[in-house]
């Protein structure tokens, strides 16, 4: 049952005279709350007396009595889990063992904590990585096994006695696991830091020095080299001699091998600190450096640029860009190996010197077709003039020029003709590969650049063609000027605006939409009979007899076109009324007699009225008046009246004679 009490705290705490000590502590007594607590200094159990001998630094008992030392020593814990302690200030003679005598309802316990108090502030400890290499970031750690809330401290980093400008991260731990103050400094050492002294200085809150730790940096680095050359400017002419010397200014660890490099490539059999070049050629121009290696790696010196001077070599021309598009810009570059660089250039176009062009580059801002041809140049420096090289060819490309659309037919062109057109151009680079035509149609292209329009339409007005290489150039549209007979001929009534009544003045117009040529003649006809040759046909006073089917014709030199037949309708009041009798105007009594009102009217008669010899209207309104059986009294004169939307008309009198039958006569 010894597992009933569980304590957690640092095993040993460190401090110095006049500082303080903060002891983080937790506990657990499973059988209930704490009843009393006594803090002993160096408790020793006396078996004889069954008591602990030692100084009581703090006492918290059931009766609540506490010693005066309690002002310096404080129990900051509680009755069930916290047993944290503070001693402020802490003295040298506080070193030793602290005994926490604790009592619960059922048990007593003594927990021991070690306290190490030094006379003066003890130094922090600098921790370095096992190996430090130049330019590789390392973390320097300064650790001090001390932290106390009542005694603030700071850790400062110094390099050769000067504060380091890198930002350090300071952290403190006051936990049951550990008590410390730590400063971490991220630092990228350079080779020049090798052998330098780094100090971690412990200071109080006011920056007063308390203690320190120092280490000497061992920065592993590649050899650091200096190169010397004779002549010092490293500029020589072909045939001269050159000496280069390599000096090691620092290496950690010691160097092992030496080599020389030209333009990044190792020189064979050159493994000493001196490089001698005798009777140099221009091929020996380049960047030289020495390379010395140690276990860290190779170190290289700065590069020496050896310049072996010579007259320009035969030149070549580079064109940016060929082929060039007309209107674009082109740059010509004269390339000639020379040392020193050429100071003057002469340019040639198709073998002829280009005046005023003395630069390495020739820039033509707007290329034209005549700029095409061969370009060459000559370079010149202080040592001489080079030779003219083979030159470069400039190809200038442009769209087809002066494109025209040509009509091959004899003029004029008539509707329905077959028309042939050709697309012509003056020049083109690259060659024309295709043609385009506007507008598009289902037309034949019997050969490249030729268009055949079968059965040309009256409305084919203009045609344009394009000749195409990489670009298309369009010709101006050409007018076909197709001639055709008048179109859309129709009869149009001008007046009256409403329906035609008998007696009206009437005008008819012969209209057409278009005609080419424009000169036309008109013809009017009714039932095959020619009526007039004007665009209008006029009636001063129209009569019903003028009604009928009219057509007009329009013709030009190409042909003539007829309108659709147009019906002229004349409205008039009933006329030519007469009463006809059936079976005749003499009828025997008892038989049947039918009187019919006949008339001529447009529109037809809509309403009839019958009258007798006394002009008395009869109650009959249909076209036929039927008398059955007819009586002698029906004898007399009858007339009728017809009405339509235009007006009325009346018939003359017609007499009906009804005679007696033989029976009637026999009775008499």
């Amino acid at each position: 049952d010894s597992s009933k009490w569980v304590f957690e705290h640092p095993e040993t705490l460190y401090a110095w005279e006049g500082a303080c000590v903060w002891i983080p502590c937790t506990y657990r007594a499973l059988d209930g709350d704490l009843e009393s607590f006594i803090l002993f200094h160096n408790p020793e159990y006396n078996k004889n007396t069954s008591k602990f001998d030692g100084t009581r630094l703090y006492e918290s008992t059931k009766d609540g009595k506490v010693p005066s030392e309690q002002k310096r020593v404080q129990f900051l814990g509680d009755k069930n889990k916290n047993c944290t302690l503070s001693i402020h200030p802490v003295h040298l003679n506080d070193s030793g063992q602290l005994g926490l005598r604790m009592e619960s309802k059922t048990e007593k316990w003594m927990e021991r904590i070690h306290l190490n108090v030094s006379e003066r502030p003890f130094p922090p400890h600098i921790q370095l990585p096992p190996e430090i290499q130049e330019s590789q970031e390392v973390t320097l750690t300064c650790l001090l096994n001390f932290s106390c809330y009542g005694y603030p401290i700071q850790l400062q980093w110094l390099l050769e006695g000067v504060p380091m400008r890198q930002a350090a991260v300071t952290s403190t731990s006051l936990t049951i696991k550990s008590v410390f103050t730590r400063s971490e400094l991220k630092f990228s050492p350079q080779w020049s830091h090798h052998g330098k002294i780094v100090t971690c200085q412990l200071q109080d809150a006011d920056g007063k020095f308390l203690s320190n730790d120092t280490v000497q940096l061992n920065v592993k680095h590649t050899p650091k080299l200096e190169i010397k050359v004779t002549p010092s400017d490293a500029i020589v002419r072909e045939g001269d001699s050159v000496t280069m010397t390599c000096e090691v200014s620092s290496s950690n660890p010691e160097y092992t091998t030496v080599s020389w490099l030209k333009d990044g490539t190792s020189l064979k059999k050159q493994n000493t600190f001196t490089l001698n070049l005798r009777e140099v050629t221009k091929d020996q121009s380049g960047k030289y450096c020495c390379q010395v290696s140690n276990d860290v790696g190779p170190g290289r010196s700065e590069e020496v640029f050896l310049q072996v001077q010579y007259a320009p070599e035969p030149s070549t021309v580079q064109i940016l860009h060929s082929p060039a598009v007309e209107g674009s810009q082109v740059e010509f570059l004269c390339m000639s190996l020379a040392n020193p660089l050429p100071t003057n250039y002469t340019w040639y176009h198709n073998g002829k010197e280009m005046q005023g062009r003395t630069e390495e580059k020739v820039h033509i801002p707007k290329i034209l077709p005549w700029h095409a041809g061969t370009y060459s140049c000559v370079a010149e420096n202080i040592l001489g003039t080079g030779q003219r090289g083979p030159g470069a060819e400039l190809d200038v490309q442009y769209p087809p020029k002066k494109v025209t659309t040509v009509i091959q037919n004899p003029m004029p062109i008539r509707e329905g003709d077959t028309v042939t057109l050709s697309c012509n151009y003056n020049s083109s680079n690259p060659s024309v590969t295709r043609y385009e035509w506007k507008p598009h149609g289902a037309w034949e292209e019997p050969s490249l650049g030729v268009l055949k329009i079968q059965n040309v339409g009256w409305d084919n007005t203009t045609i344009a063609c394009a000749a195409c290489n990489s670009w298309c150039s369009w010709a101006s549209p050409v007018a076909l000027n197709v001639q055709y007979a008048p179109r859309d001929v129709r009869v149009r009534k001008i007046k009256p605006l409403s329906e035609i009544h008998s007696g009206n003045s009437v005008s008819l117009q012969c209209d057409f939409s278009s005609s080419h040529p424009k000169e036309v003649q008109f013809f009017w006809e009714k039932n095959g009979r020619l009526l007039g040759k004007e665009s209008q046909l006029n009636f001063d006073s129209i009569s019903p007899e003028d009604a009928g089917s009219y057509s007009c014709w329009v013709n030009n030199s190409i042909g003539q076109t007829a309108s659709k037949a147009w019906t002229l309708e004349v409205l008039y009041a009933p006329r030519r009324l007469r009463v006809s009798m059936s079976p005749g105007d003499q009828v025997m009594e008892g038989k049947s007699a039918t009187l019919t009102c006949e008339s001529d009217a447009n529109p037809p008669v809509s309403h009839y009225t019958w009258f007798d010899w006394n002009n008395q209207s009869l109650p009959y309104h249909s076209q036929k008046l039927r008398l059955e059986p007819v009586k002698v009294q029906h004898s007399g004169a009858y007339w009728c009246q017809g009405t339509n939307s235009v007006g009325k008309g009346r018939s003359p009198l017609s007499t009906l004679t009804v005679y007696y039958s033989p029976e009637t006569i026999g009775r008499r």
Partner: nanobody, 127 residues
Framework: QVKLEESGGGLVQPGGSLRLSCTVS????????MGWFRQAPGKEREAVSC???????TYYADSVKGRFTISRDNAKNTYLQMNSLKPEDTAIYYC?????????????????????WGQGIQVTVSS
Amino acid sequence: QVKLEESGGGLVQPGGSLRLSCTVSGFTLDSYVMGWFRQAPGKEREAVSCISSSDGVTYYADSVKGRFTISRDNAKNTYLQMNSLKPEDTAIYYCAVDKPFYDGGYLYTCPVDFDSWGQGIQVTVSS
């Protein structure tokens, strides 16, 4: 309230025996330590013998080892059998009871600062 009462003391000749008894009342803990202490005139009180209830482990002062025997019963009463008594064993004998005491996990058989004490009983060894 815990009450302890010692009995069995008295006057005995050197080499003689006595059996001290301690009766406990009002003590409720299941785990405890009982002990016998003595105080001779002009001297500090000293532990004579202790016994632990949990494991029955006993403690004897060097001066009584082999002569005295401590025991207990289930009623929380303890006994000290004293044989081969010597004049220097003359003292007032006290009975004490307390909770177990651990020091960093080590259980003391004779705990520190016993909380409950008897009135004491005189033992005199004299010829």
